[in-house]
Amino acid sequence: LRKVAHLTGKSNSRSMPLEWEDTYGIVLLSGVKYKKGGLVINETGLYFVYSKVYFRGQSCNNLPLSHKVYMRNSKYPQDLVMMEGKMMSYCTTGQMWARSSYLGAVFNLTSADHLYVNVSELSLVNFEESQTFFGLYKL
Amino acid sequence: LRKVAHLTGKSNSRSMPLEWEDTYGIVLLSGVKYKKGGLVINETGLYFVYSKVYFRGQSCNNLPLSHKVYMRNSKYPQDLVMMEGKMMSYCTTGQMWARSSYLGAVFNLTSADHLYVNVSELSLVNFEESQTFFGLYKL
Amino acid sequence: LRKVAHLTGKSNSRSMPLEWEDTYGIVLLSGVKYKKGGLVINETGLYFVYSKVYFRGQSCNNLPLSHKVYMRNSKYPQDLVMMEGKMMSYCTTGQMWARSSYLGAVFNLTSADHLYVNVSELSLVNFEESQTFFGLYKL
């Protein structure tokens, strides 16, 4: 069976890393485990990993935004940032604003790697399933 | 044969969903049909679906922009929005502006699903083949 | 072996096309050659090609930004732009700013095709490995 995941935004995320909907809607989870916000790899190989985050706010103050996909493995002391997007000075002060960040690339992942998504400002994330998501598939 | 499509912008179109160039240039269409703006799936399975839209204008008024990939199937009464990008307050009032929206993710699609792309304002889309496109491939 | 590449930003790039890190860090290079900024295809077929570029500056002057993935082959007289992103009027004058451009799509590539990435303003690119990258894989 193809190893694949597509998880969607979960609006009751209260902490980092982001938590994801892994059951309902347009979710996919096959041959990969989901645990506390993370996708857990159980077979070493090449994977295409992607994530989109939809940021929005009522009144722009140009708070710097970041969106990271990172990897954690008990063998390594530190998280590895695989992909990252940053935004600064992206809207007109005081206005309602909205913007997305998209990341996607190929990585060589190892069994037991845990992949997570982090954002700089949780309160500015909108968690609609079509707007904010996290996924991967084994090539 | 690999089921794959890469369609590019078609500039003389006024209709929604967007219509696409399916014959000339860097277009690909194999094992998938194109019909009235839609990619028609003929084999159930996992697909990576993507789209990019290039918006631009002469004089910025921050008209809200949206870019959606959605699915229609005669079995279901309503369109399903698979992926969506929105932009608000993205340029400086009165200036010439340009911005892209990119979407891409994995979905479990069923034979006879029709996939389309919709935008909130057709007049602001530039249809260059390298800038605005819609594609998928079966994993 | 799967034909795949993931190259990351190389900060000593001084000219166009962009040059890439092909050895250290989260780099992948298998069944594809890297030569003077280009990925060289050695087997005809369908490839998913992607790139992300992270632009940033100390003081916004809204210099138009472009990010292109293009193809060169000795059989053809001219470069073919496969994918392109453009940005104009994207930040508030005088402010520190940051923005990414992401491109990704499927193409039918031929043995001996050379793929490159070009940007309009090299001095505004940040080359962190997680932020600026270029990759592909054979479907």
């Epitope: - | 179109s13 006024r14 008024n61 935008v119 909130s120 | -």
Partner: antibody, heavy 119, light 111 residues
Framework: QVQLVQSGAEVKKPGSSVKVSCKAS????????ISWVRQAPGQGLEWMGW????????QYNENFKGRATLTTDKSTSTAYMELSSLRSEDTAVYFC????????????WGQGTLVTVSS | EIVMTQSPATLSVSPGERATLSCRAS??????????IHWYQQKPGQPPRLLIF???HLESGIPARFSGSGSGTEFTLTISSLQSEDFAVYYC?????????FGQGTKVEIK
């Protein structure tokens, strides 16, 4: 900058036709609709129809179907509105306006052309 | 067709005061994404000028004292502090479906 320049005032007899032109500049003519809106003396605004210069497609308000004909000439970036079988109640200022396709708001207007129908 | 009804027909206001203009649609002109209502200003002998689009978005070059609100069938144009150049006729227009229709207008005059 975007400009829409209309032809001059016309005086017409009942039963005749009038053709008003609208020359566009400062933008890509084939990417936006041109709508026509009329305003009778001292009255409000009435939408007549739109035409899309990109492919020549058009839509009309039922009140004007069969009497109004919208056309464009892409080579000169000019839109035309012809109204036939004129009657006195067609006396009005006729405006062309650039219209965004999806949002259908009129963001730039011509200066207006007064058409007087009188015997 | 959707009928747009504006009120009041005439509004007498002193310079510096706030003006609130209403526009009611005979059926909803909103979707999940946008409210398809636009506001225009017209002065004698001139074409209309777009002020507000999609119910609440200020057109480029329009002063910030103009604002719009509402959804569904009820919409409002507010001028926070009337200037002498704001005395004019104001029209709302919907673009939810064909035909596009305008309200009959509200004349804002000096009190």
């Amino acid at each position: 900058q975007v400009q829409l320049v209309q032809s001059g005032a016309e005086v017409k007899k009942p039963g005749s036709s009038v053709k008003v032109s609208c020359k566009a500049s400062g933008y890509t003519f084939t990417r936006f609709d041109i709508s026509w809106v009329r305003q009778a003396p001292g009255q409000g605004l009435e939408w007549m129809g739109w035409i899309f210069p990109g492919d020549g497609s058009s839509q009309y308000n039922e009140n004007f179907k069969g009497r109004a004909t919208l056309t464009t000439d892409k080579s000169t970036s000019t839109a035309y509105m012809e109204l036939s079988s004129l009657r006195s109640e067609d006396t009005a200022v006729y405006f062309c306006a650039r219209s965004l396709i999806s949002t259908a708001m009129f963001d730039h207007w011509g200066q207006g052309t007064l058409v007087t129908v009188s015997s | 067709e959707i009928v747009m009804t504006q009120s009041p027909a005439t509004l007498s206001v002193s310079p510096g005061e706030r003006a609130t203009l209403s526009c009611r649609a005979s059926k909803s002109v909103s979707t999940s994404d946008f409210s398809y209502i636009h506001w225009y200003q017209q002065k004698p002998g001139q074409p209309p000028r777009l002020l507000i689009f999609l119910a609440s978005h200020l057109e480029s070059g329009i002063p910030a004292r103009f604002s719009g609100s509402g959804s569904g069938t009820e919409f409002t144009l507010t001028i926070s502090s009337l200037q002498s150049e704001d005395f004019a006729v104001y029209y709302c227009q919907h673009s939810r479906e064909l035909p596009r229709t305008f309200g009959q207008g509200t004349k804002v005059e000096i009190k």
